[in-house]
Interface confidence: low
């Protein structure tokens, strides 16, 4: 490998470098490619250098683009026409120049927040680009059509939101604002300019009209309508609160739609239960008055007892089922009919008949085993499957099994 | 501090009866959903059955569903679980236990258990 | 039904992942010592009831949730359970039993 590579000038872009060449193993070293390493890197990275090739013959080169106020340490790899040499040992650790900063925070954006604020976020700057020591941003703001920008300095190179307060600031206003940079060497550039709006009001009137009806043992649908006066705070979407009879309204569950959808399903609730229901609409600022409560029962859980006996004989193409019908409990809902479900063997998508009798017939290809299971459906849902029956490939025309 | 002390275990034989009972004291029994859960020798746990604080829903798996009954005194601060057909895989250890919340998310959140008091069905 | 790995082991002070597949509207964990009653460590997918150390959380995504020990302990070592409920049964996964090496 090249001997250990010295850094004989540095500016904040820059550094000029010079090495001693190595041993070249009887084959003369074509090239040399210099490599950089900071603390922000990953690794050894090929750099840009003047001369952009470095002949084999060179032991100088000027390492160019680096960014300013980081330190640096660098080592040269020959090459030669048997292939890629060791790398020379590491150089020193170097810091460039400072500068001033050139880019600017990603993401400048904001809102929400409390009564009579504007709030305003951003990325900050990543180190290894703040080019300098006292790094800091700006941040500029003003009503949207306004001419005279209000600048706030903030003196912390991780500060990434500043909150204006004040009680000119009316609610969901939208202000223009841009955030830049600064370090010990001076101001950079300023962001693009972006509109923010102004913290809003939450909702001021309940949603009308809630309507809720139970779907089965374990669902329920709730309606409602948009609140029929003007609100004064923007409606994100609604929060739906639920919670059984007999307990408290302090432990209801919630769940929120978003935007302006107008119902809502509420699963995984419990069988033949008194629920109550109340609706609030919803925005950045808080939740507003909740609408009048509704009530609803889930009907009935599905039956729990599954087919039995089931029975399948085949003829032709077609396979006869049949099997014994179920019967509910005092606290289910009534068997409504049943859904036969059947799929080849290998095939994953399922197939369903629908029946009010318990008996059905399928007609079905002969060259295919078919997994086959039967379970009672209801007002309450579906109710428990039967063991899946697997039905072997038939050659002969006449077969029949339990 | 919330206590479940259950009793009335014991050895039974197939197709008897038998009757558990769970004393409650430390918080307010009429508030929360409350459970049995067993769990048969070496083997995992099982929900039972749950009973709503008022005691107007009860839940139960299906393999005690037509057999076992769950039912609650609140007057008496007391659980019951009434057992009947009994079959030697019913043998297992009964737990008695509270939901955390008088909101139940069901086996999501029985926060207090009994010691359990052990049904061994067997001729 | 929920499905669990019948058993995990873990080395001292590592970190741990458990899961447990099947639906549910809400999922708890239980931590079951020899001889002893369960205890709740997680409710409703995320919660930790007081007094349970804050290496023990939980997370749900889909169909699976997951109980997390970051820095298992030698105490740690039980069998853990999954719990939930789906319409109207409530059920229990297989168990799980961790080992701490």
């Known amino acids: 490998p090249p001997e250990a590579v010295t850094i004989d000038e540095i500016t904040d872009t820059t550094a000029q470098l010079s090495w001693r060449p190595g041993p070249d193993n009887h084959s003369p070293i074509t090239m040399y490619v210099i490599q950089a390493r900071t603390p922000f890197s990953v690794g050894w990275q090929a750099v840009s250098t003047v001369p952009e090739l470095i002949d084999g013959k060179t032991f100088t080169a000027t390492v160019v683009g680096l960014n300013p106020w980081v330190e640096y340490e660098f080592r040269t790899v020959a090459a030669n026409v048997i292939g890629i040499g060791e790398p020379s040992r590491p150089s020193e650790k170097r810091r460039t120049e400072e500068a001033l900063p050139e880019v600017t925070p990603a993401n400048v954006s904001g809102g929400g927040g409390s009564k009579s604020e504007l709030v305003i976020t951003w990325e900050t700057v990543p180190e290894e680009l703040q080019n300098g020591r006292g790094f800091g941003y700006v941040v500029a703001f003003r009503p949207y059509g306004k001419m005279i920008w209000m600048l706030t300095v903030l003196a912390s190179a991780d500060a990434s939101r500043y909150v204006f307060r004040n009680e000119s600031v009316h609610p969901f206003s939208p202000f223009e604002v841009k955030v830049g940079v600064f370090n010990n060497k001076g101001e950079g550039p300023f962001s693009p300019t972006t509109v923010v709006y102004s913290a809003e009001e939450e909702p001021t009137k309940p949603p009308a009209s809630i309507f809720a009806r139970s779907l089965s043992a374990t669902d329920i649908e709730v309606f409602w309508a948009s609140p029929l006066e003007k609100n004064r705070g923007r409606i994100q979407g609604y929060e739906v609160k639920y919670w059984r009879h007999e307990d408290k309204e302090e432990n209801a569950r919630k769940i929120r739609t978003v935007g302006n959808q107008t119902s809502t399903k509420i699963t995984n609730l419990k069988g033949s239960v008194l629920y109550h229901l109340a609706v609030k609409a919803y925005n950045s600022a808080g939740t507003g008055p909740s609408s009048a409560t509704v009530n609803v029962t889930t009907r009935k859980p599905p039956p729990s007892q599954p087919p039995g006996n089931i029975i399948w004989n085949s003829s032709d193409s077609k396979i006869i089922l049949n099997w014994d019908q179920v019967k509910a409990l005092d606290n289910e809902s009534e068997v409504k009919g049943y859904k036969v479900l059947y799929r080849w063997n290998r095939q994953s998508s399922t197939s369903v008949i629908e029946t009010n009798k318990t008996s059905v017939e399928l007609s079905l290809p002969f060259d295919e085993d078919y997994i086959i299971e039967i379970k009672p459906f209801s007002d309450g849902g579906d109710g428990s499957s039967s063991e899946q029956i697997r039905i072997p490939k038939i050659s002969n025309a006449y077969a029949r099994g339990s | 501090e919330v206590q479940l002390l259950e009793s009335g275990g014991g050895l039974v034989q197939p197709g008897g009866s038998l009757r558990l009972s769970c004393a409650a004291s430390?918080?307010?029994?009429?508030?929360?959903?409350m459970f049995w859960v067993r769990q048969a020798p070496g083997k995992g746990l099982e929900w039972v059955a749950e009973?709503?604080?008022?005691?107007?829903?009860?839940w139960y798996a299906p393999a005690v569903k037509g057999r076992f009954t769950i039912s609650r005194d609140n007057s008496k601060n007391t659980l019951y679980l009434q057992m009947n057909s009994l079959r030697a895989e019913d043998t297992a250890v009964y737990y008695c236990a509270k939901s955390a919340f008088t909101w139940s998310y069901g086996a999501a959140s029985i926060q207090a258990w009994g010691q359990g008091t052990l049904v061994t069905v067997s001729s | 039904e929920l499905t669990q790995d019948p058993a995990v082991s873990v080395a001292l002070g590592q970190t741990v992942r458990i899961t447990c597949s099947g639906s549910s509207g809400s999922y708890g964990w239980y931590q079951q010592k020899p001889g002893q009653a369960p205890v709740l460590v997680i409710y409703d997918n995320t919660n930790r009831p007081s007094g349970i150390p804050d290496r023990f959380s939980g997370s749900s995504s889909g169909n699976t949730a997951s109980l997390t020990i970051t820095g298992a302990q030698a105490e740690d070592e039980a069998d853990y359970y999954c719990?939930?409920?789906?319409?109207?049964?409530?059920?229990f996964g297989g168990g799980t039993k961790l080992t701490v090496l």
């Open positions: 719990g939930g409920y789906w319409g109207s049964t409530d059920v």
């Open positions: 009973i709503s604080g008022g005691g107007g829903s009860t």
């Open positions: 430390g918080f307010t029994f009429s508030s929360f959903n």
